[in-house]
Amino acid sequence: APVRSLNCTLRDSQQKSLVMSGPYELKALHLQGQDMEQQVVFSMSFVQGEESNDKIPVALGLKEKNLYLSCVLKDDKPTLQLESVDPKNYPKKKMEKRFVFNKIEINNKLEFESAQFPNWYISTSQAENMPVFLGGTKGGQDITDFTMQFVSS
């Protein structure tokens, strides 16, 4: 059976939107009006992995682009990147672990924990116009809480 996917945008708990920053990076900044069109639309696929009531494994692709968020070690540090894939083979139910995030819902907010690197989360900074990254701390200065907005296909 084909993998189930939905289109959505994400905003951090400061209401910053996510946009492309160069070919292989995302950044977070406040957008309004026409600029809202810049925000990336994700194709969130529901994939195989450990699942519970509040924890759902997903892959985050960029809609109509053959790019997926992935978690890899760079200089011995878990790092978030946008990775190019063959569109003929993706998305698929059994995604490689580096593409999988545990979508965790807490108090109407979402966290995205790397399946490859437990306790590392998709994060943004308080500052404007700075990269989205994989952070190893929750509840500190860095933001790990997001809201999801559904986008019609």
């Epitope: 900044l29 900074s125 404007e128 116009n129």
Partner: antibody, heavy 118, light 107 residues
């Protein structure tokens, strides 16, 4: 008054290492992104590296990737740049700078000169 | 990487002149552009950020304009202390990049 004071520069042989420090005062250091920017003698400005307030996010120029490491100690209000495998082309004045709105450098230190030569 | 090209690379002018420096980005950088002034032996000083926003304490004879890929720094009525080198910088994406600089000399 915002102050940034670099130290640790000097003469080093090719292949050698050096650690630069930048002591910050006059603002809440732990809330700001920080940059290192360098300027070779008689040349323009080159961005080197950035670090987030928590230290969780770092980025580097391709020219220094894998050789330089940016870090910070918020308890000491100090920014660092560990420079390994130094090359002649790393010779420059190294500035630390506080990151202002959206990625500009709103305050700069006076710079410290690094000379890589045999 | 985004390339930033400044022109002219140097210019001779007189006190009281109106001067325009151009900065071109190799791709759209939205409004993430800053201008700096550097005098010999000193660190750069932020003049303008977000294309048009004057940094606190910078005289109003400095102004910035532009959008997308083409930007200008204008100095109305050059003063003796304005003879320096000026750099543009994009902050749209990492690696951040600077223009090559424009040296403003006394005619």
């Amino acid at each position: 008054e915002v102050q940034l004071l670099e130290s640790g520069g000097g003469l080093v042989q090719p292949g050698g290492s050096l650690r630069l420090s930048c002591a910050a005062s006059g603002f809440t250091f732990s809330k700001y992104f920080m940059f290192w920017v360098r300027q070779a003698p008689g040349k323009g400005l080159e961005w080197v590296s950035v670090i987030s307030p928590s230290g969780g996010m770092t980025r580097y120029a391709d020219s220094v990737k894998g050789r330089f490491t940016i870090s910070r100690d918020n308890s000491k209000n100090t920014l660092y740049l560990q420079m390994n495998s130094l090359r002649a082309e790393d010779t420059a004045v190294y500035y630390c700078a506080r990151v202002g709105y959206g990625g500009n450098s709103d305050y700069w230190g006076q710079g410290t000169l690094v000379t890589v030569s045999s | 990487d985004i390339q930033m090209t400044q022109s002219p690379s140097s210019v001779s002018a007189s006190v009281g002149d109106r001067l325009t420096i151009i900065c071109r980005a190799s791709q759209d950088i939205n409004r993430w552009l800053a201008w700096y002034q550097q005098t010999p032996g000193n660190a750069p000083k932020l003049l303008i950020h977000s294309v048009t926003s004057l940094q606190s304490g910078v005289p109003s004879r400095f102004s910035g304009s532009g959008s997308g890929t083409d930007f200008t720094l204008t100095i109305n009525s050059l003063q003796p202390e304005d003879f320096a080198t000026y750099y543009c910088q994009q902050a749209d994406s990492f690696p951040l990049t600077f223009g090559g600089g424009t040296k403003v000399e006394i005619k």
